[in-house]
């Protein structure tokens, strides 16, 4: 019967007694940077070309005995998970292996860099179809390794890496912390984060998604027909590399940004028990388990968005945090969040010719996060319209005044330390969907976009008194592009998007002694692209 | 994911203007930085990746590596160029004493230097 991990990543329509999704990734080459591998194992024979690349450190210890099967164990298993005949994800994918880890599973940053350079040179000498690079390894944060990954990604290569097995913030490790790399955490058959001895899967904002990574059956280097069960974020990353190979084989022109958005979109949502993660990491860690798309084609019509959290700003008075989208994504909205509630909002601003999302800490605050909503919007022309603080009782408002521009997000930023001490009523304008409204002492920023067929609407959900959390979701066929809170007073900790739901967090009324007039409203901006839908229908 | 350093340790080694008239001073106002792994047991001192500024050509990388070797030799230090990078990042991998870091950071075209460190199968 089908192993649990293959069943987990398979949409119901493909489930039979066998795992045989439509295209096995035959147009894609997957590079594996790992240990040596037993390339003639029955599960992978003919699928893996062992390159002559080898850059590994000496094994530790004077009495180390090099046993071939042990040297090959990690890499052979991963090659099997990616493309194995019977237990692999992308059965049609061809692989190339580079040896950067020694018989003890240890390598160096420099050896990995030289390996990545080897791949780039191979790509230049003999351009083939789409390339996926699997990096089932981790070291401490490395500026140079992250930079090399960035360069390779910008050359059109999809890099997939293990989040790390240290039960720690993945941002402290490389290449897991490289923004251009798809970073994968591990979950088990119960959709729980994987525990590995006293440690376990890494987590946090640098993880893109999770995938099966416990008790994964794959090729064993003990014999040519043997299988073994292994666990770790390497196994999880191998699943995503296989899924990526299949997606790219079906749609070879997909960019890295498009692939990442699809991986997120087709993942199983909200199935991971977040209680396993440290409390301060729960909001930052994506609750996503990778899965194959239900159909290999026809996803192009959707407006894809994802949420990108910044690093923590730190506690100083003027501290700021910046969240950035990938080069070919559009920043459609910007929000902020602070656990202490002390923040001075957020704003969208240009940096190096691209919009970024900047959040501002407040005096006495423990720090803030900036949260960017990053979307794929072809032929988009977006700009930010700002209204300075109105100082009048009606509050500050700003709208999209250019012809054909629609509102995709609202941000507000204030200089006063505590808006909560200034409590004028905020009047809600009705029938003006292209308008952002905020506190009279805040400057308001509207993200206004023009794109073929783009239409957006505002959805609100308010509750009379703060109860920790208010949510509002976009309905089927619409994508959440903007998420903000009204009125933005001191008991609002911030707003952020989780998949297609806008979440506004506030301090519990019982702890703040607030009055019921301070209603908290979650405001979602939901968009869709008629143009993308039409283009997709024409293709079909 | 963000490209900020987090807990990553960064040491900016000051340039002493009187030292090494031989070295071309880096462009005004840019100080090359030195980075090393925050996790001490994973550090591999003695091997360094010297990363050069983005548009540096291979020939300049090779010249910079040779210059480092020459200046190190003048001070009685042996160095070994293990690899010259080009294609992804301009730079070179060098085996040398940590005593030479200050000298290396003053070389022309140097953006930053990172001490090598271990990576592990996950």
């Amino acid at each position: 019967s089908i192993p649990w991990n293959l069943e987990r990543i398979t949409p119901p329509r493909y489930r039979a007694d066998e795992y045989q999704p439509p295209d096995g990734g035959s147009l894609v080459e997957v590079y594996l940077l790992d240990t040596s591998i037993q390339s003639d194992h029955r599960e992978i024979e003919g699928r893996v070309m062992v390159t002559d690349f080898e850059n590994v450190p000496e094994e530790d210890g004077t009495r180390f005995h090099r046993q071939a099967s042990k040297c090959d164990s990690h890499g052979t298993h991963l090659a099997g998970v990616v493309s194995g005949r019977d237990a692999g994800v992308a059965k049609g994918a061809s692989m190339r292996s580079l040896r950067v880890l020694n018989c003890q599973g240890k390598g160096t940053v420099s050896g990995t860099l030289i390996g990545l350079e080897f791949i780039r040179k191979s790509q230049l000498v003999q351009p083939v179809g789409p390339l996926v690079v699997l990096l089932p390894l981790a070291g401490g944060y490395s500026r140079v390794l992250n930079a090399a990954c960035q360069r390779l990604a910008r050359a059109g290569v999809v890099l997939v890496t293990a989040a790390g097995n240290f039960r720690d913030d993945a941002c402290l490790y490389s290449p897991a912390s490289a923004p251009e790399v798809i970073t994968v955490g591990a979950t088990n058959a119960q959709d729980q984060p994987v525990t590995l001895g006293t440690l376990g899967t890494n987590f946090g904002r640098c993880v893109d998604l999770f995938a099966p990574g416990e008790d994964i059956i794959g090729a064993s280097s003990d014999c040519s027909t043997c299988f073994v069960s292994q666990s770790g974020t390497s196994q999880a990353a191998a699943h995503v590399a296989g899924i990526a190979a299949m997606m790219l084989s079906a749609e070879p022109e997909l960019t890295l940004a498009e692939l990442r958005q699809r991986l997120i979109h087709f993942s199983a949502k909200d199935v991971i028990n977040e209680a396993w993660f440290p409390e301060d990491q729960r909001v930052l860690t994506p609750n996503l388990v990778a899965a194959l798309p239900p159909s290999t084609h026809g996803a192009g019509w959707q407006l894809f968005c994802r949420t990108v959290w910044s690093a923590h700003s730190g506690p100083t008075r003027m501290a700021t945090a910046i969240a950035r989208c990938a080069p070919d994504e559009e920043l459609l909205s910007c929000s902020s969040f602070s656990r202490s509630g002390k923040r001075r909002g957020e704003r969208m601003e240009a940096q190096g010719g691209k919009l970024v999302c900047r959040a501002h800490n407040a005096f006495g605050g423990e720090g803030v996060y900036a949260i960017a909503r990053c979307c794929l919007l072809p032929q988009a022309n977006c700009s930010v319209h700002t209204a300075p603080p109105a100082e009048a009782s009606m509050g500050t408002r700003v709208h999209c005044h250019q012809q054909g521009h629609v509102l995709t997000g609202c941000s507000s930023h204030w200089e006063v330390e505590d808006l909560g001490t200034h409590k004028p009523p905020v009047l809600r304008p009705r029938g003006q969907p292209n308008q952002c409204v905020g506190h009279r002492e805040a400057s308001i920023h509207a993200s206004c976009c023009h794109a073929p067929g783009l239409e957006c609407k505002v959805k609100e959900h308010g509750i009379p008194a703060p109860q920790g959390q208010v949510t509002v979701a976009c309905e089927e066929g619409w994508t959440l592009t903007g998420c903000s809170a009204l009125p933005g007073t001191s008991h609002v900790l911030g707003a952020y998007a989780v998949d297609n739901t806008c979440v506004v967090r506030s301090r519990d009324v019982s702890t703040t002694g607030s009055t019921s007039e301070e209603a908290v409203t979650a405001v979602a901006i939901c968009c869709r692209s008629r143009h993308l839908a039409q283009a997709s229908q024409e293709l079909q | 994911q963000e490209d900020e350093d987090g807990d990553y340790e960064e040491l900016v080694l000051a340039l002493r203007s009187e030292e090494d008239g031989l070295a071309e001073a880096p462009e005004h106002g840019t100080t090359a930085t030195f980075h090393r792994c925050a996790k001490d047991p994973w550090r591999l001192p003695g091997t360094y990746v010297v990363v050069l500024k983005e548009e540096t050509h291979l020939s300049q990388s090779e010249r910079t590596a040779r210059r480092l070797q020459a200046q190190a030799a003048r001070r009685g230090y042996l160095t070994k160029i293990l690899h010259v990078f080009h294609g992804l990042l301009p730079g070179f991998l060098v085996k040398m004493s940590g005593d030479l870091l200050e000298l290396a950071l003053k070389l022309p075209h140097v953006d930053y230097i990172e001490e090598d460190s271990s990576v592990f199968a996950q």
Partner: antibody, heavy 115, light 109 residues
Framework: QIQLVQSGAEVKKPGASVKVSCKAS????????ISWVRQAPGQGLEWMGW????????NYAQKVQGSVTMTTDTSTSTVYMELRSLRSDDTAVYYC????????WGQGTTVTVSS | QSALTQPASVSGSPGQSITISCTGT?????????VSWYQQYPGKPPKLKIY???NRPSGVSNRFSGSKSGNTASLTISGLQAEDEADYFC?????????FGGGTKLTVL
């Protein structure tokens, strides 16, 4: 092109041994092992075993375990199959084939065991 | 006694379609995605026609197709031609080895 070239026909007496060779070319040798298959006159195919060109590991069919030895010489890209204590029912055409997938076959070597 | 069971012979007229079955157990055919089909002419080595249940090697006519249901695999040849007359063998992985079927003689009438 991809080729497996086998040694010539052999006639052996019962109790003797035979060693058949198979030279591989045209593909990355370590990506595949070599399977050995035999076919008695007018009969079906019987898988005898497999040898790794990567590390020399072997996997023999239970029926021939103890009487067969497969070896490899990486310097000449040649694999050998030795069958000991031959009996008349070992008379067959012996084929080498690429890997477990057996997608490429040698031309066959006829081994006749007769007193 | 072969591990996989095939009909001893099948026949068909030119242009017709024929199907050859190959029945095993859950430990071989039913348990793996690696059923292959070989064509063999007298005095020649076998030639791979189908691998991994339903894949055709390059150069093999699309008249040849393979499928599997449970513990039985099938080879279908459509638009039968005179040159298809040959012996056909199936093979499958087992946990540690390989097994063949006894072979089916295809006669084109």
């Amino acid at each position: 092109q991809i080729q497996l070239v086998q040694s010539g026909a052999e006639v052996k007496k019962p109790g003797a041994s035979v060693k058949v060779s198979c030279k591989a070319s045209g593909y990355p040798l370590t990506s595949y092992g070599i399977s050995w298959v035999r076919q008695a006159p007018g009969q079906g195919l019987e898988w005898m075993g497999w040898i790794s060109a990567y590390n020399g590991n072997t996997n023999y069919a239970q029926k021939v375990q103890g009487s067969v030895t497969m070896t490899t010489d990486t310097s000449t890209s040649t694999v050998y199959m030795e069958l000991r204590s031959l009996r008349s029912d070992d008379t067959a055409v012996y084929y080498c084939a690429r890997g477990y997938g057996m997608d490429v076959w040698g031309q066959g070597t006829t081994v006749t065991v007769s007193s | 006694q072969s591990a996989l069971t095939q009909p001893a012979s099948v026949s068909g007229s030119p242009g017709q379609s024929i199907t050859i079955s190959c029945t095993g157990t859950s430990s071989d055919v039913g348990g793996y995605n690696s059923v292959s089909w070989y064509q063999q002419y007298p005095g020649k080595p076998p030639k791979l026609k189908i691998y991994e249940v339903s894949n055709r090697p390059s150069g093999v006519s699309n008249r040849f197709s393979g499928s599997k249901s449970g513990n039985t695999a099938s080879l279908t040849i459509s638009g039968l031609q005179a040159e298809d007359e040959a012996d056909y063998f199936c093979s499958s992985y087992t946990s540690t080895s390989m097994v063949f079927g006894g072979g089916t003689k295809l006669t084109v009438l």
